[in-house]
Amino acid sequence: NQDLPVIKCVLINHKNNDSSVGKSSSYPMVSESPEDLGCALRPQSSGTVYEAAAVEVDVSASITLQVLVDAPGNISCLWVFKHSSLNCQPHFDLQNRGVVSMVILKMTETQAGEYLLFIQSEATNYTILFTVSIRNTLLYTLRRPYFRKMENQDALVCISESVPEPIVEWVLCDSQGESCKEESPAVVKKEEKVLHELFGTDIRCCARNELGRECTRLFTIDLNQT
């Protein structure tokens, strides 16, 4: 293990929407911060195979798969995707690490799959495996929240059975009429599922996820029924 190179695999998300197929590049576009992909030696594999965390992206998203290699001397490399070889141009960063990148622009179904990077260094040969899939947003749902009283406690739980899991917040207002609009200073927001203190004339629970936001108002009659 000590003789193996230190490999770091990262994912870079891009904000732009340029149309292109996957291409090997040493100069990724302007982008968000790199996200570590936890590259580790694949258990019980023949040869030295590193694997990166499975990557799931939205249709049309642009990403870069990047590998940083801390190994002495020069490296040569080759990307393989669906039996096609793609050219590979490693460069070296300021810490003298070899950097290899694969840019996938405007993600489509045809670009999903396994990306294999073969690297040859002066010390050893190894393979890095990336699995890229498209996020299935057809399964996404956003349901209106409902309330449940917590057992043995004077508290209310707000539940929204949505996918992906929503962020739940209580919106509490202490005065009547127009001033209970969300931007009003009379409105208090608590981003939590459990509400221990019930106060205000207008109590709502809201759930939000990628599909939007849904709210349910709590009426006094609900307190007796939850």
Epitope: D36, L37, G38, A40, P43, A53, E56, P164
Partner: antibody, heavy 124, light 107 residues
């Protein structure tokens, strides 16, 4: 650089609800199959696994504590929140969060990075 | 829940010794087992994953073996920095469970 940091109250009264937050950086739940474990360790005792949540919202809880635990995540804040109801002095422990990495070929790596832990004391 | 039984619960050894710690699962867990090292006041550190794979940056004197119900962590030549408590963790079945720990002390 990957980091995880636990935060929450140092002191909790019996019967109260504990809310702990694990704030992560250097990775996200957005596009990679990542997860977070919560683990605790009472003073001088062994580690105990509490719960986990994955980027796809798959979650699981310790059998003995399931009725008291809720785990959730907020992708926009890079946070995982664990709530534990009806706290008791026996829940006094150091609470840790640790990363889980899920791989396309079906295996996973547990705890390649950990937070430094936060000591929670339950006392009236 | 799957019970993980570690043995011994503590051991005394000298620098240079070969140390073996075992972990037994109450049912088969294939190779879904990790080994962790913890020093007082510190968070645990991953040493071995998938029963026998060495985590990046961990010295090669640490090795793991086993499959099914019986697993072993071996330190081939104990170093001063290895005096700590070691835990196994199974992630084959929910709930995931730790062993009770093995404290390695200086003889």
């Amino acid at each position: 650089q990957v980091t995880l940091k636990e935060s929450g109250p140092v002191l909790v009264k019996p019967t109260e609800t504990l809310t702990l937050t694990c704030t992560v950086s250097g990775f996200s739940f957005n596009n990679a199959r990542m997860g977070v474990n919560w683990i605790r360790q009472p003073p001088g005792k062994a580690l105990e696994w509490l719960a986990h949540i994955f980027s796809n919202d798959e979650k699981s809880y310790s059998t003995s504590l399931k009725s008291r635990l809720t785990i959730s995540k907020d992708i926009s804040k890079s946070q995982v929140v664990l709530t534990m109801t009806n706290m008791d002095p026996v829940d006094t422990a150091t609470y840790y969060c640790a990363r889980i990495v899920g791989y396309g070929s079906g295996w996973r790596l547990l705890g390649d990075y950990w937070g430094q832990g936060t000591l929670v004391t339950v006392s009236s | 829940a799957i019970q993980m039984t570690q043995s011994p619960s503590s051991l005394s050894a000298s620098v240079g010794d070969r140390v073996t710690i075992t972990c037994r699962a109450s049912q088969g867990i294939t190779n879904d087992l990790g080994w962790y090292q913890q020093k007082p006041g510190k968070a645990p550190k991953l040493l071995i994953y998938a029963a026998s794979s060495l985590q990046s940056g961990v010295p090669s004197r640490f090795s793991g073996s086993g499959s099914g119900t019986d697993f072993t962590l071996t330190i081939s030549s104990l170093q001063p920095e290895d005096f700590a408590t070691y835990y196994c963790l199974q992630d084959y079945n929910y709930p995931w469970t730790f062993g009770q720990g093995t404290k390695v002390e200086i003889k």
